[in-house]
């Protein structure tokens, strides 16, 4: 079953995915792809890495995070209710059937209708990127009590949603990121 | 144009090995997963294996695994498949597929190679 | 592993008819990633379909896919008769890879 992320039309949605390079620089190659995770890489993608830098992308989809360290989640600009659906993280790590895939559950709501403020919007204009909204799971996943009801590789999809937390530093130092390496 | 070129193909006796390769021209090679896929005689289709572009990530069909390796050359444009231990059911013909942009589905096909398995 | 079990087995019918091939799953294919293929004796198959519904380039219009889940269909509008061959599914939603055992079109 998919972990599953909200967030409202015109924002932008985050589906966190993680995994820790063996060493600095030493990069695998991660895709993305609008549908669940097939046999191999990803259907329908949307954004590739290779083991040096971003090689494929489409327009909306970008890593904010530093892949380079690992963290490819990736963020939907400006999202409408065509962009709800399962979406598929896999690390390709070298090997015989080693990949580590995750399917993610976009979940998009109808934006609540609140007049804003004309300063509010010009300084939307400006800085666009400083109000991005980042989508957040039901709140089961965010409590100890559905944890052990998760998959270890799940696990590292949450963290980033706990990075502020305690939790989040436990989950990462019992190993819950993949650990490649 | 893509074009895909089988060989390698032959009489080989059980327990025996051969090395089948697949010349490919037409496309920017490394970008693309290849397979693959094999037909007995008068039989269906039975994919084998795959490989991603860097050749970092491969794939087999239960069937094959620990006796076959998939493997590719990039700077000569070249798939391979090892085989190895063959069995009389792998006698089939042999064909080496491009996958399309999206992977897991094969846009281009070569002609095949006829792999026979037999003492 | 999926199974993708194919019918009728063979499809007798006449240049202009509409044909209708089935393709069922032992389990749901996830996100319809579902291929069809194409295949005429002593050649290599030929691509028709994929995600269920998408046309691969080159292939003219009489050839449709449909179906979600575990019941997927090919239709071909109006036979020609290059049309007249094996047809197989194929699915990538699950490992391994599968194929159908084929339907084979042949002439009335």
């Known amino acids: 079953s998919e972990v599953e992320y909200r967030a409202e039309v015109g924002q932008n949605a985050y589906l966190p995915c993680f995994y820790t390079p063996a060493a600095p620089g030493n990069l695998v190659p991660v895709c993305w792809g609008k549908g669940a995770c097939p046999v191999f890489e990803c259907g329908n993608v949307v954004l590739r890495t290779d083991e040096r830098d971003v090689n494929y992308w489409t327009s909306r989809y970008w890593l904010n995070g530093d892949f380079r360290k690992g963290d490819v989640s990736l963020t939907i600009e400006n999202v409408t209710l065509a962009d709800s659906g399962i979406y598929c993280c896999r690390i390709q790590i070298p090997g015989i059937m080693n990949d580590e895939k995750f399917n993610l559950k976009l979940v998009i709501k109808p934006a609540k209708v609140t007049p804003a403020p004309t300063r509010q919007r010009d300084f939307t204009a400006a800085f666009p990127r400083m109000l991005t909204t980042r989508g957040h799971g039901p709140a089961e996943t965010q409590t100890l009590g559905s944890l052990p009801d998760i998959n270890l590789t799940q696990i590292s999809t949450l963290a980033n949603e706990l990075r502020d937390s305690r939790l989040a530093n436990d989950l990462r130092d019992s190993g819950a990121t993949i650990r490649i390496g | 144009e893509v074009q895909l070129l089988e060989s390698g193909g032959g009489l080989v006796q059980p327990g025996g090995s051969l090395r089948l390769s697949c010349a490919a021209s037409g496309f920017t090679f490394s970008n693309y997963w290849m397979s693959w896929v094999r037909q007995a005689p008068g039989k269906g289709l039975e994919w084998v294996s795959a490989i991603s572009g860097s050749g970092g990530s491969t794939y087999y069909a239960d069937s094959v695994k620990g006796r076959f390796t998939i493997s590719r050359d990039n700077s000569k444009n070249t798939l391979y498949l090892q085989m190895n231990s063959l069995r009389a059911e792998d006698t089939a013909v042999y064909y080496c597929a491009k996958d399309h942009w999206d992977p897991n589905f094969l846009d281009y096909w070569g002609q095949g190679t006829l792999v026979t398995v037999s003492s | 592993e999926i199974v993708l079990t194919q019918s009728p087995g063979t499809l007798s019918l006449s240049p202009g008819e509409r044909a209708t091939l089935s393709c069922r799953a032992s389990?749901?294919?996830?996100?319809?990633?579902l291929a069809w293929y194409q295949q005429k004796p002593g050649q290599a198959p030929r691509l028709l379909i994929y995600?269920?519904?998408s046309r691969a380039t080159g292939i003219p219009d009489r050839f449709s896919g449909s179906g979600s889940g575990t019941d997927f269909t090919l239709t071909i509008s109006r036979l020609e008769p290059e049309d007249f061959a094996v047809y197989y599914c194929q699915q990538y939603g699950s490992s391994p890879l599968t194929f159908g055992q084929g339907t084979k079109v042949e002439i009335k």
């Open positions: 995600g269920a519904s």
């Open positions: 389990q749901s294919v996830s996100s319809s990633y």
